[in-house]
């Protein structure tokens, strides 16, 4: 039945974004407000948990922005990256499924800077596996629900 | 039945990436290791061959990178592009379904440069048609399986 | 039945692209030529109208380009953006579902500039709701059907 197919669309919860410019895991996401929603999957401890074996299309859209009123950037040469990772509880290891991004030179000559990344791909996921998002420079994230989000939907069963 | 739906997720085989900065077809992809997989489609001669008529969602993620330890770039002004093309054997012609990319200025002021492209779209594909990937500056491709890949999955039949 | 699932893939009609550098709604799209197609959805007045309740995957690919032969840019600092919006006729309001893009410095040192944006996400859509595309700097849009397009396909019913 089409309505039984698992899906999730999670939007950034910007009230708890880590500091630092290194790669960090984003653990605060909305799952039940605005565009955010989830069905037959679970969101727990910052991870999207698979409840049903299958092949899923996974996607992420990550927006970074800086306005001069936010202060001076520590460096104008930035690596703005996203990594979509899969963790298996049985085998406690994390693997990157997809990555994207760009190095950027955000000079002081412009008062506003913006950059978005989109990644997507088709992956076999087993029940209990967890999907999480890591980004660099999290304090530059755009907190809007239309800007920074990730999701998944099941396309087909495993043979 | 959901499990009969064709799909493919092919990841770059970097052992055989062409040199040059012109537009080239990428013919070496993995289909059965790591995240790469294929079902009810065929991979042959660098092309993804459709075995079942239908409407498919096609996608590609292409990452380019350069580190100063790799040597000096021939030019700092680059066109980093991807073209997803469809070839029909019956009518021996090639058509671009999707394109994406960016012109970049990768100056020597930074030791590392990175850029990713993502494209995706919904297309009618007939049995025997072939999907291939062309890129500019192939020697700058990121060889990781999470970085450079393309794929397809069937969404619905043709009426 | 798989063949009853609504979908659309609309490609830019460049004969009627607005001028200006501000954010504008793109109203001219092809729905029945080349790669463009539509089924169980309606295209009217520049908007993609949902005819069937469901969860849909929405996507857009927007390419911008400039060649020096087109003349001098009014400013070299550009915001190249796309906004995928949903309008409900019942509640006459517009909401942005997805956004993407980048600020760019397109200097006169290079004769050609190019940049593409891709966004995608999974959304609940009700019959009568309308999807439209807004972009900044529409006069810089790439008019090719493989470059500038958007689409949707239904993945599952609403519970």
């Amino acid at each position: 039945k089409l309505e039984a197919q698992p899906f999730a669309h999670l939007t950034i919860n910007a009230t708890d974004i880590p500091s630092g410019s290194h790669k960090v895991s984003l653990s605060s996401w909305y799952h039940d407000r605005g565009w955010a929603k989830i069905s037959n999957m679970t969101f727990s401890n910052g991870k999207l948990i698979v409840n049903q074996d299958g092949f899923y299309y996974l996607y992420a859209n990550i927006c970074f922005r800086h306005h001069e009123t936010s202060g001076d950037l520590a460096t104008e040469y930035l690596q703005l990256m996203v990594y979509v990772t899969k963790t298996s509880i049985k085998i406690p290891s994390s693997h990157t499924l997809m990555k994207g991004g760009s190095t950027k030179y955000w000079s002081g000559n412009s008062e506003f800077h913006f950059y978005s990344i989109n990644v997507g791909g088709f992956f076999k996921l087993r029940s209990g596996e967890e999907i999480s998002i890591e980004v660099s420079n999290p304090s530059l994230l755009d907190p809007d629900q239309d800007a920074t989000y990730f999701g998944a939907f099941k396309v087909r069963d495993i043979d | 039945k959901l499990e009969a739906q064709p799909f493919a997720h092919l990841t770059i085989n970097a052992t055989d990436i062409p040199s040059g900065s012109h537009k080239v077809s990428l013919s070496s992809w993995y289909h059965d290791r790591g995240w790469a997989k294929i079902s009810n489609m065929t991979f042959s001669n660098g092309k993804l061959i459709v075995n079942q008529d239908g409407f498919y969602y096609l996608y590609a993620n292409i990452c380019f990178r350069h580190h100063e330890t790799s040597g000096d770039l021939a030019t700092e002004y680059l066109q980093l592009m991807v073209y997803v093309t469809k070839t029909s054997i019956k009518i021996p012609s090639s058509h671009t379904l999707m394109k994406g990319g960016s012109t970049k200025y990768w100056s020597g002021n930074s030791e590392f440069h990175f850029y990713s492209i993502n494209v995706g779209g919904f297309f009618k594909l007939r049995s025997g048609e072939e999907i291939s990937i062309e890129v500019s500056n192939p020697s700058l491709l990121d060889p990781d399986q999470d970085a450079t890949y393309f794929g397809a999955f069937k969404v619905r039949d043709i009426d | 039945k798989l063949e009853a699932q609504p979908f659309a893939h609309l490609t830019i009609n460049a004969t009627d692209i607005p001028s200006g550098s501000h954010k504008v709604s793109l109203s001219s799209w092809y729905h029945d030529r080349g790669w463009a197609k539509i089924s169980n959805m309606t295209f009217s007045n520049g908007k993609l109208i949902v005819n069937q309740d469901g969860f849909y995957y929405l996507y857009a690919n927007i390419c911008f380009r400039h060649h020096e032969t087109s003349g001098d840019l009014a400013t070299e600092y550009l915001q190249l953006m796309v906004y995928v919006t949903k309008t409900s006729i019942k509640i006459p309001s517009s909401h942005t579902l997805m956004k993407g893009g980048s600020t760019k410095y397109w200097s006169g040192n290079s004769e050609f500039h190019f940049y593409s944006i891709n966004v995608g996400g999974f959304f609940k859509l009700r019959s009568g709701e309308e999807i439209s595309i807004e972009v900044s700097n529409p006069s810089l849009l790439d008019p090719d059907q493989d470059a500038t397009y958007f689409g949707a396909f239904k993945v599952r019913d609403i519970d």
Epitope: S19, G20, H22, E76, Y77, N137 | - | -
Partner: antibody, heavy 121, light 107 residues
């Protein structure tokens, strides 16, 4: 736990050089800018230098510009301050401190070491 | 250069008192102002950043306010552990400037 430990201080003659080190642990060192701040005997705090998380940007107080060099080795989680042409007025307790924000300047210094003493006489 | 002037330089108070320390800038500045506590033989401790944001783990009796040229650090009810020297610090255009300090001592 998050910790900064300075070393390399000592007694040195005017005009000579000294190199201070600051070993970081308990946080992702490569993600944060780092400062050197000093306190002369009986005086207040004085900012000396700062370096961005990637080592690209470095800024100095006017009093040390051209004489002191800040650097870092992210692979070893270590911050350095190379002090040349030392003067009597450089005598102080030298602290290293971590930037609260890795991306922006201006948010303050949230982790400090205990300091290392430099005496120029 | 922008000068930061703290007042008073010394403050005598008792446990339970409400204490206010002022930091004045020589010209109007942004809110990039922090407050620190320093005790002899100990590492300085960040209390407030961005003029009014309380650093994680700092007791809520500490508060920061102000804008333009005048900023204040307030301790709503002085505790025995609060006797120390307090410094304001301002950031502007890749330069960090400390005030001269305010010593809070037992009355």
């Amino acid at each position: 736990q998050v910790q900064l430990v300075e070393s390399g201080g000592g007694v040195v003659q005017p005009g000579r050089s000294l190199r201070l080190s600051c070993a970081a642990s308990g946080f992702t060192f490569s993600g944060y800018g780092m400062h050197w701040v000093r306190q002369a005997p009986g005086m207040g705090l004085e900012w000396v230098a700062v370096i961005s998380y990637d080592g690209i940007n470095k800024y100095y107080a006017d009093s040390v510009k051209g004489r002191f060099t800040i650097s870092r080795d992210n692979s070893k989680n270590t911050l350095f301050l190379q002090m040349n042409s030392l003067r009597a007025e450089d005598t102080a307790l030298y602290y290293c401190a971590k930037c609260l924000s890795g991306t922006y300047w201006g948010y303050g210094m949230d982790v400090w070491g205990q300091g290392t003493t430099v005496t120029v006489s | 250069d922008i000068q930061m002037t703290q007042s008073p330089s010394t403050l005598s108070a008792s446990v339970g008192d409400r204490v206010t320390i002022t930091c004045r800038a020589s010209q109007s500045i942004s809110s990039w102002l922090a407050w620190y506590q320093l005790k002899p033989g100990k590492a300085p401790k960040l209390l407030i950043y961005k003029a009014s944001s309380l650093e994680s783990g700092v007791p809520s009796r500490f508060g920061g306010s102000g804008s333009g040229t005048e900023f204040t650090l307030t301790i709503s009810s002085l505790q025995p552990d609060d006797f120390a020297t307090y410094y304001c610090q301002h950031y502007n255009s890749y330069s960090w400037t400390f005030g001269q300090g305010t010593k809070v001592e037992i009355k």
